[in-house]
Interface confidence: medium
């Protein structure tokens, strides 16, 4: 079910299936900033909270992924959806909750022994005839299974920030994604004028660390819009 993602989890790079399939309407949606209870194509929000829009998985929390929530799939509207539990259908690793990954279209435990004991008792998962690769992922980026057991250090290849050790995030570097340090106070950060614009970056920066936000540097207020420098500053 996963399509080629060119070493990226960017949803916009996914061909039709995400459009055709969409996110699972029954899954809880991002509780930050709000809790949204989807019901097919109709959505009810709690306390007027809005769903958190996204362009790729990294914009969502570690227990979330980015997808279109409507059944039947309008890929143009994407929000953060709750990660999918073990034994649920998936299209890519980021959809599965931490400690699981997407194997043959099903979220399975990273602990292979656990997987064999529970899943294979009830479902036989087989590889596709002509499109599957050795690891059972259809035309997808292959990564060492080790990354699902140990947190990646700086420079390690990753799929999402939860794959990286504490203090690191998963960010694009050329055409792959690696663990990079979360930004500290005073470090230059990237402020995106519109959601998803950083999907075009070849060298993606991490987000600002806890208690910090990416704001225009005070002495740059007078500069032209295009040259404004943003740094991580205390709230």
């Amino acid at each position: 079910t996963l399509n080629s993602v060119l070493n990226s989890n960017a949803i916009k790079n996914l061909p039709p299936p995400l459009g055709g399939a969409a996110g699972h309407p029954g899954s809880a949606v991002s509780a930050a900033p709000g809790i949204l209870y989807p019901g097919g194509n109709k959505y009810q929000t709690i306390d007027n909270y809005q769903p958190y829009p996204c362009a790729e998985d990294e914009e969502c929390g570690t227990d979330e992924y980015c997808a279109s929530p409507t059944r039947g799939g309008d890929a143009g509207v994407q929000i953060c959806l709750a990660c999918r539990k073990r034994r649920k259908r998936c299209m890519r690793h980021a959809m599965c909750c931490p400690g699981n990954y997407c194997k043959n279209g099903i979220c399975v435990s990273s602990d292979q022994n656990h997987f064999r004991g529970e899943i294979e008792e009830t479902i036989t998962e087989s590889f596709g005839n002509d499109h599957s690769t050795l690891d059972g992922y259809s035309r997808r980026t292959t990564l060492s299974s080790k990354m699902y057991h140990t947190k990646g250090q700086e420079g390690s290849v990753c799929l999402r920030s939860s794959d990286c050790a504490s203090g690191l995030c998963c960010a694009r570097h050329f055409w792959s994604k690696i663990c990079k340090p979360v930004l500290k106070e005073g470090q230059v950060c990237t402020k995106h004028r519109r959601k998803g614009s950083h999907g075009l970056e070849i060298f993606q920066r991490c987000y600002c660390g806890e208690g910090l936000s990416c704001r225009i540097q005070k002495d740059h207020h007078q500069a032209s819009n295009s040259s404004r420098l943003h740094t991580c500053q205390r709230h």
């Epitope: 055709g20 029954g26 034994r87 649920k88 259908r89 279209g105 998962e125 087989s126």
Partner: antibody
């Protein structure tokens, strides 16, 4: 319109195999899973497994493990379900049904294919 | 595996009656439940998805409710064309499981 059209009725002998086809039209075949469900006369619905036409990935119910094979030919938008080592209790109507990837609501069904296993 | 238990297995009601069918899951399935209608000799038809959402084109007299392990399917005012067998189906995780069905007939 969106529809799934299945192959015709089959009569098979015990031990033989049967291959049922399910042709999709009216939507992008690779964008939805195909599930197979069977129903013996006067009985309830029994889920056999799913196939993702895009990747060819499949998941089978344990009961059918080793006997069922789900395949597809994307060039003709057709899914296939082959059941081998047939026995009399496999006599049933076999349905293909479309579901989207995560929500397993079967919103489009084939008309059903009757498979009779008799010596 | 998750087992789905429907009750009653059959029921008889009059046109205009309110009809209720229940479905119980052997473990918590959140709202990952669908309801189907199957008329004799026909393929099933999806009526309700995600426990309470009406599928497009399905009359509003059909409704569903519940979450966790207990679910209810209701026909607010039974019509002659509603005579069929109704099935619940869980998709909380694989393998998918259907209830054994509830046969509905007119008195």
């Amino acid at each position: 319109q969106v529809q799934l059209v299945q192959s015709g009725a089959e009569v098979k002998k015990p031990g033989a195999s049967v291959k049922v086809s399910c042709k999709a039209s009216g939507y992008t075949f690779t964008s939805y899973d195909i599930n197979w469900v069977r129903q013996a006369t006067g009985q309830g619905l029994e889920w056999m497994g799913w196939m993702d036409p895009n990747s060819g990935n499949t998941g089978y119910a344990q009961k059918f493990q080793g006997r069922v094979t789900m395949t597809r030919n994307t060039s003709i938008s057709t899914a296939f379900m082959e059941l081998s080592s047939l026995r009399s209790e496999d006599t049933a109507v076999y349905y293909c049904a479309r579901t989207d990837y995560f929500y397993f609501g079967m919103d489009v069904w084939g008309q059903g294919t009757t498979v009779t296993v008799s010596s | 595996d998750i087992q789905m238990t429907q009750s009653p297995s059959s029921l008889s009601a009059s046109v205009g009656d309110r009809v209720t069918i229940t479905c119980q899951a052997s473990q918590d399935i959140s709202k990952d439940l669908n309801w189907y209608q199957q008329k004799p000799g026909k393929a099933p038809r999806l009526l309700i998805y995600d426990a309470s959402n009406l599928e497009t084109g399905v009359p509003s007299r059909f409704s569903g409710s519940g979450s966790g392990t207990d679910f209810t399917f209701t026909i607010s005012s039974l019509q002659p064309e509603d005579i069929a067998t109704f099935y619940c189906q869980q998709y909380d995780h694989l393998p998918i499981a259907f209830g054994q069905g509830t046969r509905l007939e007119i008195k």
